[in-house]
């Protein structure tokens, strides 16, 4: 669920390669897909399946495609526009402690309790004690990365496409 | 777990700016690839996304709001603000900010504030 | 922009019975669709992802479904606690949009 965003996830672009389309800025923002020059006057296309940028921007460059680890399976590919999507493999889910790999499902519940959750690529069953029903699971941690940013960033007007 | 919080005058008279700020807590609006949501619910109606800021300050808009529509974003105090100028009645609203995960893998809006009733009455 | 239809805007249930709740896309978004879930006077919370089938912490009762214009969210087995407003959020275009909400009423 988080977004891991840091300097090395930047994907340097060399000058406009010939396959590179450019456009002009819309009120100093380039649209999904693409990322901003460094004079601010051109939009510069993401290289598919390499780097992507999701919203309306002036990032200096698109953002690198995440590869899907071993154990992980590929749900949708990179796009200029989208991020990989990775999962973990049937039987193993991505635990709180340890985010960056997916661990193995227990197969049943400890003598006292009962089994309410299956398994699936984001917690591991789902176990509550019989008289109590008191859960025990795992869940997905919201892990961020800080990217340092000078403070207060003046106010400024929406900005959009014609 | 990072959380969201609304603040602002609650009643607004027509054609002046409402104006509200979003605090964060339990994380840094700093992260990179979160854009920072500002939504509005009408009375008993549905959901209307306003905009995003980033935090470097580009924003972005809906077009049926962007003539009035202001965003900003102060990383010092780890909040940002929405201003929304002339309004009429017709801006009565419930008024969210919210976390819009810019990863590209998962895009939705989690966390939201609790959200804050604006009301634009003489 | 991008119109989300729901269907039904209101749906009357029981505990244990199966709800299935339709969206609509006026155009194709791929599995770029969101649902949440809204009680009355608190804020929407996010429920699923369709395009990974993600929801953390979500029961598993619930479940998303289809790609292109046509989606489904499906309660298997509807709770006490799971009445309420569920909404679809196209994420696929901006601006982005929302549907105009399903309510699930006690019968």
């Known amino acids: 669920e988080s977004a891991l965003i840091t300097q090395q996830d930047l994907a340097p672009q060399q000058r406009a390669a010939p396959q590179q389309k450019r456009s002009s800025p819309s009120e100093g923002l380039c649209p999904p897909g693409h990322h901003i020059s460094e004079d601010g006057r051109d939009c510069i296309s993401c290289k598919y399946g390499q780097d992507y940028s999701t919203h309306w921007n002036d990032l200096l460059f698109c953002l690198r495609c995440t590869r899907c680890d071993s154990g992980e399976v590929e749900l949708s590919p990179c796009t200029t526009t989208r991020n990989t999507v990775c999962q973990c493999e049937e039987g193993t889910f991505r635990e709180e402690d340890s985010p960056e790999m997916c661990r193995k499902c227990r197969t049943g519940c400890p003598r006292g309790m009962v089994k309410v959750g299956d398994c699936t690529p984001w917690s591991d069953i789902e176990c509550v004690h019989k008289e109590s029903g008191t859960k025990h699971s795992g869940e997905v941690p919201a892990v961020e990365e800080t990217v340092t940013s000078s403070p207060g960033t003046p106010a400024s007007p929406c900005s959009l496409s014609g | 777990q990072v959380q969201l919080q609304e603040s602002g005058p609650g009643l607004v008279k027509p054609s002046q700016t409402l104006s509200l700020t979003c605090s964060v807590s339990?994380?840094?609006?700093?992260?990179?690839?979160?854009?920072w949501s500002w939504i509005r619910q009408h009375p008993g109606k549905g959901l209307e996304w306003i905009g995003y800021?980033?935090?470097?300050?580009?924003?972005y808009c809906n077009p049926s709001l962007k003539s009035r529509v202001t965003i900003s974003v102060d990383t010092s105090k780890n909040q940002f603000s929405l201003k929304l100028s002339s309004v009429t009645a017709a801006d009565t609203a419930v008024y969210y900010c919210?976390?819009?995960?810019?990863?590209?893998?998962?895009?939705?809006?989690?966390?939201w504030g609790q959200g804050i009733l604006v009301t634009v009455s003489s | 922009d991008i119109q989300m239809t729901q269907s039904p805007s209101s749906v009357s249930a029981s505990v244990g019975d199966r709800v299935t709740i339709t969206c609509r896309a006026s155009q194709g978004i791929s599995s770029w669709l969101a649902w949440y879930q809204q009680k009355p006077g608190k804020a929407p919370k996010f429920l699923i992802f369709v395009a990974s089938s993600f929801q953390s912490g979500v029961p598993s009762r619930f479940s998303g479904s289809g790609s292109g214009t046509d989606f489904t969210l499906t309660i298997s087995s509807l709770q006490p606690e799971d009445f309420a407003t569920y909404y679809c959020?196209?994420?696929?275009?901006?601006?982005?949009?929302f549907g105009q909400g399903t309510k699930v009423e006690i019968k």
């Open positions: 800021i980033y935090y470097s300050g580009s924003t």
């Open positions: 919210a976390r819009d995960n810019g990863s590209g893998s998962y895009d939705w809006f989690d966390p």
């Open positions: 959020q196209q994420a696929n275009s901006f601006p982005r949009t």
């Open positions: 339990g994380g840094s609006i700093s992260s990179g690839g979160y854009y």
